[in-house]
Amino acid sequence: MMTGTIETTGNISAKKGGSVILQCHLSSTMAQVTQVNWEQHDHSLLAIRNAELGWHIYPAFKDRVAPGPGLGLTLQSLTMNDTGEYFCTYHTYPDGTYRGRIFLEVLESSVAEHSARFQIP
């Protein structure tokens, strides 16, 4: 039975050219996290964090994606095209798969701020 919940940074905004942290947190379960996958809105994989093999950033994103903090992901040099949904998929044993959603809006305005509050989607 899956008892856990994924908390995410929810809807966030950030400045064009800046950076943003995408964070998910799995709670209320003792399941072992074997792998976390980070996907973009078009379902392309940005990064994998395997519990045994470590981090793998996909080649197309190597220049703009940094692992961490923790199981999160840092997107750098943001462009307007980065606006959209991001998904964290937690593969766990024995529970199975948990999935969280974050919506990132990249703003031209210099007043854009990265909101770091956690929300349950």
């Epitope: 395997n50 045994e52 093999l53 470590g54 793998h56 996909y58 080649p59 593969h91």
Partner: antibody, heavy 122, light 107 residues
């Protein structure tokens, strides 16, 4: 050319251990993950685990955890797979296989060793 | 672990036939699906990676398609050397599990 050469056939008694080697040549050894796959007689392919030759990190299939150890020797460009507490069901051909892309997630194994037959019999 | 289910487990076909083999994953694996060919007594050979990319040196009569959970390997015109066993494998999540195989035999 890129090549993986495995050690010769082994016959072992139940409860014993076996260590199979896989020597790589023709490419930068540390840049490609190396996986191990086995095939019992008349059966399909079974993924056992994988090792990152540069750092030595490993990931094993849950079925083999506690019984399998994968190591590497960068000085000889060789990876090893040791399986302990052997039983008759471990009788199989054991293959090493190289990941298709360097310094990346190991999707697809493009170069395979010739296979090592391990027979477990009392 | 992700379960990979292949169908059919065996099929009989003639030279020149179009052959289709399917592979289903127990959960979405995006496009992280590989196809291998294995002949008796030989090591497997990578045919297709990332669901639809043809491995270097593999004839163009082999093609792959699909994403998510459902995938297909197609041989457009079966040749004598294509009689073998074919395996799918997911490479999204460790352990990188294989399907049970599909044996392509001569009719």
């Amino acid at each position: 050319q890129v090549q993986l050469v495995q050690s010769g056939a082994e016959v072992k008694k139940p409860g014993a251990s076996v260590k199979v080697s896989c020597k790589a040549s023709g490419y930068t050894f540390g840049s490609y993950y190396m996986g191990w796959v086995r095939q019992a007689p008349g059966q399909g392919l079974e993924w056992m685990g994988i090792i990152d030759p540069s750092g030595g990190r490993t990931s094993y299939a849950r079925k083999f955890q506690g019984r399998v150890t994968m190591t590497r020797d960068t000085s000889t460009s060789t990876v090893y797979m040791e399986l302990s507490s052997l039983r008759s069901e471990d009788t199989a051909v054991y293959y090493c296989a190289r990941a298709r892309t360097p310094s990346s997630w190991p999707y697809g194994m493009d170069v395979w060793g010739q296979g090592t037959t391990v027979t477990v019999s009392s | 672990d992700i379960q990979m289910t292949q169908s059919p487990s065996s099929l009989s076909a003639s030279v020149g036939d179009r052959v289709t083999i399917t592979c289903r994953a127990s959960q979405s694996i995006n496009s992280y699906l590989n196809w291998y060919q294995q002949k008796p007594g030989k090591a497997p050979k990578l045919l297709i990676y990332a669901a639809s990319s043809l491995q270097s040196g593999v004839p163009s009569r082999f093609s792959g398609s699909g994403s998510g959970t459902d995938f297909t390997l197609t041989i457009s015109s079966l040749q004598p050397e294509d009689f073998a066993t074919y395996y799918c494998q997911q490479s999204l999540l460790t352990p990188f599990t294989f399907g049970g195989g599909t044996k392509v035999e001569i009719k």
